[in-house]
Interface confidence: low
């Protein structure tokens, strides 16, 4: 039955035995490899269980996304071995006596975390209506896309397990013909025969549906079409000379071939049954690639089929499904808007070869690293003239560091500061200055991501200012004029500039004002005197510039 | 408005190496699919490489494989070729262009830069 | 890979004509296919994507159509700035220009 992802929950099954890829291969196989693999661990990494009610399946985790080709044999191999057959799967309706529940009616609900995320849309922008993929013969993808939630920021930021079934149950590629439906329409199930009359069957009655599995092996790029039946049967081809089936299965068939297989046993009567055989192309000749832009990748997912190189089988009779949650998408692409940041989320995908299943993967996505939120109960004051200090609490969502700008016009500085910190100083501020404080959160993902910033403002408080600069002295014979200008840092609210004029020891003017130009008149002629010129904010006075200057002989005398 | 610039062209020897750059503006750079198509002189248009938003998809034709690398700079808003064991019929004007969607064609194109190949 | 066959190769026509280019695939390629316009010494212009889509700021003359393996670019009533190379472009398995079409006055 169709298995559900929650939340917290680890759902199991149960898998077979993985060579790896120094080991041989068994000998009909079909072998896959992921195109990278990563330590995750504790993702739900496990297998979807096939599409059909019986099924050995074989695990591919993770790929990365970009380029994810899910057959390029780089990396661990897989194999997948045959399984034992049971239930036929025919194209006829299937109206009679089975009575087996379709894997697919199993797991239909709905997208799941968010109100948001019903806006799916198909590449490049249909949408489609279709709910589930059809219950007919061919299973439907059954699953659920419940976002599994692992908050830890520690994990890769957007990656994907992969999980390949093809040719591992009854399912896929059942290239079966019915020449002759039974009476009930229903279909046949080949199970042993038991007699109750003497009349044998004629063999096209008892083998009127027979379940085909296409098993590629990926070392000779050749086919096995394996033959679902419970006996041992012969096949011929059209020249009826000689049996080409071995254990039931035609070997070594290339891709896109067609051919017609006679099947016959002593336990029927009557011509053989004709059977076509449809061979579908390589398997390494599709790649799903990761079409998200990375700067939606929070949000998107983008996923698409490409065939990455030509082969002769008719394109027509390849079609492609995807199903996210209940949602299905009969293309061979989708682009999933709207979804949670930071979630994993999963989505089967197959390919059909003339309407029988072909390649199936299953991916499980983790949307990128969200937009973080923004720091909370941000307070920042002065602590003293060259100093700051910025507090917060850290913001809800994943972060990886703070970025903290502090501007005092013109002048911007930015730091990153560590994820940990809650409070910083800030050092080497100017006096009387007012600074403007923003703190943000960011993470890097595919794209950095900047949260919205958290401000505040302080001033930080006065201190002495600097000298006056430029100081120029004329004299005459009984007076001075000094002039200078502002210092280069004030420190403080606009204030005062003072001369003091001392003759030895004695203060003989104090002079100020606003403007560095002062008269000083009444001097002795001929005298030295000292000029202390400085500025005062408000607060602190500065250095004062000192000059020795004499008045000049007395032109008069 | 949307601009690309390549730079980089220029006469190499056969066998020799030359390195393209892509400069990108007027659109969210890491948003796009982006590629190079080049063009031999009185000739048709030839599909180079194409680059992935991320850099993390690239594909060439087999005629430039192992010899061409394509790569992006995100940050800079640049777009790279990097051509080694160049020949003759390697001679082009090289355009870099971004793709409308992921695997679609180009909308936006630069004005191109000639890669002389000649002994 | 996926070839593309463009004809004609070249043709002749006068301002008002209707003018028709085709594109052949080698197979399928689920229209997924672009024209471009070039003019000598300038960087290729697209006109048309995904067979029958017009891009931003090409004027209405200019259509396409098809599936399968065959597309077809019309200028419906040509002008004098239409006289150009044109290109097809498939994107559905990595991109293969067309051979062009160059577009002379009669």
């Known amino acids: 039955q169709g298995s559900t992802l929650s939340p917290t929950g680890r759902r199991t099954t149960k898998m077979p035995s993985v060579p790896l890829s120094s080991d041989p291969l068994p000998t009909h196989t079909t072998a896959f490899s992921p195109a990278s693999i990563s330590e995750r661990e504790n993702d739900f990494s496990e297998t979807t269980p096939s599409l059909s009610s019986d099924n050995t399946s074989t695990q591919v985790s993770p790929d990365s996304l970009d380029n994810a080709s899910a057959f390029n044999t780089t990396g661990v191999s897989s194999a997948l071995t045959p399984h034992l057959p049971t239930h036929a799967d025919s194209q006829t309706p299937s109206t009679g006596t089975d009575t087996q529940t379709p894997s697919g009616s199993a797991a239909n609900t709905t997208l799941s975390p968010t109100p948001r995320s019903n806006d799916i849309s198909d590449v490049p922008g249909e949408r489609s209506t279709a709910s589930t993929f059809p219950t007919d013969p061919i299973s439907p993808l059954a699953t659920t896309l419940i976002p599994a939630r692992n908050s830890s920021a520690a994990l890769p930021a957007r990656t994907s397990n992969t999980t390949i079934t093809a040719n591992t149950s009854v399912s896929y590629l059942n290239a079966s013909e019915t020449t002759t439906p039974s009476p009930s329409g229903s279909t046949v199930i080949s199970t042993p025969t038991i007699a109750t009359t003497t009349s044998k069957p004629t063999c096209a009655e008892k083998y009127a549906t027979i379940p085909v599995d296409y098993l590629y092996n990926n070392k000779t790029k050749l086919f096995t079409a394996k033959l679902n039946v419970n006996e041992n049967v012969e096949c011929t081809n059209n020249n009826h000379t000689h049996n080409i089936c071995t254990n039931n299965e035609v070997l070594n068939l290339p891709e896109c071939k067609e051919m017609n297989v006679f099947v016959s046993h002593n336990s029927c009567t009557d011509r053989h049954k004709e059977l076509k055989l449809d061979v579908p192309p390589e398997v390494e000749k599709f790649q799903l690639d990761d079409c998200t832009p990375d700067v939606e990748a929070n949000t998107t997912i983008c996923l698409k089929w490409k065939i990455i190189e030509t082969f002769a089988c008719d394109k027509s009779k390849i079609t492609y499904r995807f199903q996210c949650g209940n949602k299905t998408y009969n293309k061979e692409g989708i682009y999933l808007e709207n979804l949670e940041p930071e979630y994993e989320y999963k989505c089967d995908s197959e390919i059909l070869y003339n309407n029988h299943k072909y390649i199936n993967i299953t991916k499980l996505i983790k949307t990128d690293f969200g937009i973080p939120g923004q720091p909370q109960n941000v307070v920042c004051r002065h602590e003293d003239a060259h100093q700051g200090v910025i507090t917060w609490n850290p913001p809800q969502r994943s972060f990886h560091n703070f970025t903290l700008c502090y501007v005092n016009k013109p002048a911007k500085k930015c730091l990153i500061l560590d994820k940990h910190l809650t409070t910083y100083h800030l050092q080497n501020l100017k006096p009387y200055t007012n600074y403007s404080l923003s703190l943000h959160a960011y993470i890097i993902a595919k794209v950095q991501r900047n949260g919205t910033a958290a401000t505040c403002n302080f001033t930080t408080e006065s201190a002495p200012p600097s000298q006056v600069q430029n100081m120029i002295v004329s004299t005459s014979d009984n007076s001075m004029h000094v002039k200078c200008e502002v210092p280069r840092d004030v420190n403080g609210p606009t204030g005062l500039y003072h001369l003091e004029v001392e003759a030895g020891n004695t203060l003989v003017r104090n002079l100020s004002q606003s403007k560095c130009d002062f008269s000083v008149n009444n001097l002795q002629y001929s005298t030295y005197y000292n000029l202390k010129a400085y500025y005062h904010n408000g607060k602190y006075s500065g250095e004062p510039v000192i000059l020795r200057e004499s008045t000049s002989y007395n032109s008069k005398a | 408005e949307v601009q690309l610039v390549e730079s980089g062209g220029g006469l190499v020897q056969p066998g020799g190496s030359l390195r393209l750059s892509c400069a990108a503006s007027?659109?969210?750079?890491?948003?796009?699919?982006m590629t190079w198509v080049r063009q031999a002189p009185g000739k048709g248009l030839e599909w180079v490489s194409s680059?992935?938003?991320?850099?993390?998809?690239?594909y060439y034709p087999d005629s430039v494989k192992d010899r061409f690398t394509i790569s992006r700079d995100n940050a800079k808003n640049s777009l790279y070729l990097q051509m080694n064991s160049l020949r003759a019929e390697d001679m082009a004007v090289y355009y870099c262009?971004?793709?409308?969607?992921?695997?679609?064609?180009?909308?936006?194109w630069g004005q191109g830069t000639l890669v002389t190949v000649s002994s | 890979g996926i070839q593309m066959t463009q004809s004609p190769s070249s043709l002749s026509a006068s301002v008002g004509d209707r003018v028709t280019i085709t594109c052949k695939a080698s197979?399928?390629?689920?229209?997924?296919l672009d024209w471009y316009q070039q003019k000598p010494g300038k960087a290729p212009k697209l006109l048309i994507y995904?067979?029958?889509n017009l891009h931003t700021g090409i004027p209405s003359r200019f259509s396409g159509s098809g599936s399968g393996t065959d597309y077809t670019l019309t200028i419906s009533s040509l002008q004098p700035e239409d006289f150009a190379t044109y290109y097809c472009?498939?994107?559905?398995?990595?991109?293969?220009f067309g051979g062009g079409t160059k577009v002379e006055i009669k």
């Open positions: 472009l498939q994107h559905i398995s990595r991109w293969t």
């Open positions: 262009a971004r793709l409308y969607y992921y695997d679609g064609g180009g909308d936006a």
């Open positions: 995904n067979t029958n």
């Open positions: 680059i992935s938003s991320s850099g993390g998809s690239i």
């Open positions: 197979q399928d390629i689920n229209k997924y």
């Open positions: 007027g659109f969210t750079f890491n948003n796009y699919w």
